[in-house]
């Protein structure tokens, strides 16, 4: 039973005091009780609820020799870093016998300079583009009034008179700093200073000016860049791949893009060393002293077909009486497009040239006119694409067929097609 004649008499001889301070404060509340017999465990309440994980200590000092004598019990509660959630009414509680005793309350309050819940963050913005900044602070004490500053200059005449939690900036033409001051009855707290870096706007109207099989000429319109002149623009080209799925605004392509830099002005660039008849995606970004703009969306473009860059290879021509057998292999040089076929020309010393379109076959048997006594007969072959003929091979003289040589059977070409292209020149 608690000390005293009446069972209802509180054992508490010292009650928790009050603590009021700023966030982060370390404080201690104490209560003291005097009991007879076995000292009880002291519990702490906040706003009537037991604090299960309280950082509390307990000291028990006997006042006599006998265990049944009185004991002084001191319990201390530590608040390590005061937060708003720690505020409230604190009491000690003990169970003695079948009774519960609660101390007089002490109060923990938070009162100090404003505390920022949100501060303006560094960011990049395109020149002359609207954006918002956020700042939020709380007490207690309330109210907390905000004052925004741009480049250390207040944007309102007094705290609370201008924009508060959100600052709308219609656009900037130079890199600037923003901060916010939070004012309450205790004083002023200044937020971190956010640097807003002004980058060039995204270029517009990226388009093709001209196309060649291995190069594309592109142009674009630069965006505004504030007070910072553009130093250069960077163009990227990447091979299109059906599986890659480059769409407008999609993530970067997986392979390494071909990157070229353009001095500006002019806002134009010739992109060389490309593959003919190949789909690409291109994009452009422009840079000032403050950094690069965002990239434009990927623009699909395609290089046109070109003519083959070399003649067919390994041409052989053999003659057996009035027939000539000619065969060859595809050019080793790039075709620069889709091979549509081959043209063949043959000519005797004193006879006009005959030009034929062979199609995609790589061999032909010619039915020579007359008795086959034409002398010094030579053959030339060229490959062609939709863009035109590639270079003709050097003239290959017809060799007489010797017995033992293989002579495969081929479709005979009796009538040459009408010449449709320029003659080879010997």
């Amino acid at each position: 039973a608690p000390r005293g004649t009446q069972a209802e008499e509180s054992p508490f001889v010292g009650n928790p005091g009050n603590i009021t301070g700023a966030r982060g404060l370390t404080g201690t509340l104490r209560c003291q009780l005097q009991v007879q017999g076995e000292p009880p465990e002291v519990h702490w309440l906040r706003d009537g609820q037991i604090l299960e994980l309280a950082d509390s200590t307990q000291t028990q000092v006997p006042l006599g020799e006998d265990e049944q004598d009185d004991w002084i019990v001191v319990s201390q509660l530590r608040i390590t870093s005061l937060q708003l959630s720690d505020t409230g009414q604190y009491q000690c509680l003990v169970f003695l016998g079948h009774q519960t005793f609660v101390s007089q309350p002490g109060y923990v309050g938070l009162e100090g300079l404003p505390y920022f819940l949100e501060e303006p963050e560094d960011r990049t913005v395109a020149a002359n583009t609207p954006f918002n900044l956020s700042c939020q602070a709380q007490g207690p004490p309330e109210p907390v009034d905000l004052l925004w500053l741009q480049d250390a200059v207040p944007l309102a005449t007094a705290p609370g008179h201008g924009p508060q939690r959100s600052l709308h900036v219609p656009g900037l033409n130079k890199t600037s700093s923003f901060s916010c001051e939070a004012h309450n009855a205790k004083g002023v707290t200044t937020s971190r200073t956010a640097t807003i870096t002004v980058l060039p706007q995204q270029p517009r109207n990226l388009h093709l000016v001209s196309r060649q099989p291995t190069e594309l000429e592109v142009a674009w319109t630069p965006g505004l860049s504030g007070i910072y002149p553009l130093t250069h623009c960077t163009l990227q080209a990447v091979l299109s791949d059906d599986g890659m799925g480059i769409q407008a605004g999609e993530p970067d392509p997986p392979e390494e893009p071909l990157t070229s830099q353009a001095s500006v002005p002019p806002h134009q660039l010739r992109l060389g060393s490309l593959h003919p008849h190949t789909p690409y995606h291109i994009r452009v970004a422009c840079t000032s002293s403050q950094g690069p703009s965002s990239w434009t969306h990927w623009l699909p473009v395609e290089t046109p077909e070109g003519v083959p860059l070399g003649p067919p290879e390994n041409i052989s021509a053999t003659r057996n009486g009035s027939q000539a057998f000619v065969h060859w292999q595809e050019p080793r040089a790039p075709l620069q497009g889709t091979l549509l076929g081959y043209r063949l020309a043959y000519q005797g010393q004193d006879t006009p040239e005959v030009l034929m379109d062979i199609g995609l076959r790589q061999e032909v048997t010619l039915e020579l006119q007359g008795d086959g006594s034409v002398s010094n007969l030579t053959v030339c072959v060229a490959a062609y694409t939709a863009a035109g003929d590639g270079p003709w091979s050097l003239p290959v003289p017809l060799e007489a067929w010797r017995p033992g040589q293989a002579q495969p059977v081929h479709q005979l070409v009796k009538e040459p097609s009408t010449p449709a292209f320029s003659w080879p020149w010997w």
């Epitope: 010292g14 009650n15 928790p16 005091g17 009050n18 603590i19 301070g21 700023a22 982060g24 404060l25 370390t26 404080g27 201690t28 509340l29 104490r30 209560c31 003291q32 309280a54 950082d55 509390s56 200590t57 307990q58 000291t59 028990q60 001191v74 201390q76 530590r78 390590t80 870093s81 002490g106 100090g112 300079l113």
Partner: antibody, heavy 125, light 107 residues
Framework: EVQLVESGGGLVQPGGSLRLSCAAS????????IHWVRQAPGKGLEWVGW????????YYADSVKGRFTISADTSKNTAYLQMNSLRAEDTAVYYC??????????????????WGQGTLVTVSS | DIQMTQSPSSLSASVGDRVTITCRAS??????VAWYQQKPGKAPKLLIY???FLYSGVPSRFSGSGSGTDFTLTISSLQPEDFATYYC?????????FGQGTKVEIK
Amino acid sequence: EVQLVESGGGLVQPGGSLRLSCAASGFSLSGSWIHWVRQAPGKGLEWVGWINPYRGYAYYADSVKGRFTISADTSKNTAYLQMNSLRAEDTAVYYCAREYSGWGGSSVGYAMDYWGQGTLVTVSS
Amino acid sequence: DIQMTQSPSSLSASVGDRVTITCRASQDVSTAVAWYQQKPGKAPKLLIYSASFLYSGVPSRFSGSGSGTDFTLTISSLQPEDFATYYCQQSYTTPPTFGQGTKVEIK
């Protein structure tokens, strides 16, 4: 008479471990917070951490967090500082100290009223 | 963390002199400041707690004052046993931090 006695100091190689003890007498460890404070040779005082022996809750300085562990055994009235992954910059005299408990109902902050004699920890290869 | 800056870092004084040591906190610490005395090879001893309260057994020539960010330890009449290094410590926030110390030497 209140007394704190540290032991366990010595020479240890970088990356090694050491366990310091702080034996209390004249008061009950469970009634206060026990702090560890260190002092590098010729330098000032640096707080290492504290423990509430009654609950076992500990709190550490950033410089030792994750490497040092403070514990207590109230039945032996002794606090411990387990030091792992020791570095040359941990070389110091290590003190344990009792937090002063005023008798008022509340206080802000704290002070350390009883200190041990200190034990030297040298981290060197 | 709160920084505690002590001044001077050292001083020379004679027995009987009045000595003042100051400590400045980097932010408001209310009155949560303690002062300690340390002699070579010995543990620190508590002199003042809560900025101005004299700890039990400490001679009355020691006194402390201050609140907020500026604190002072005064020794009204320096005695031979007072030659030592003195440290201030804030405990308003955790971690507690100490000043760098002021060494009081014999002139």
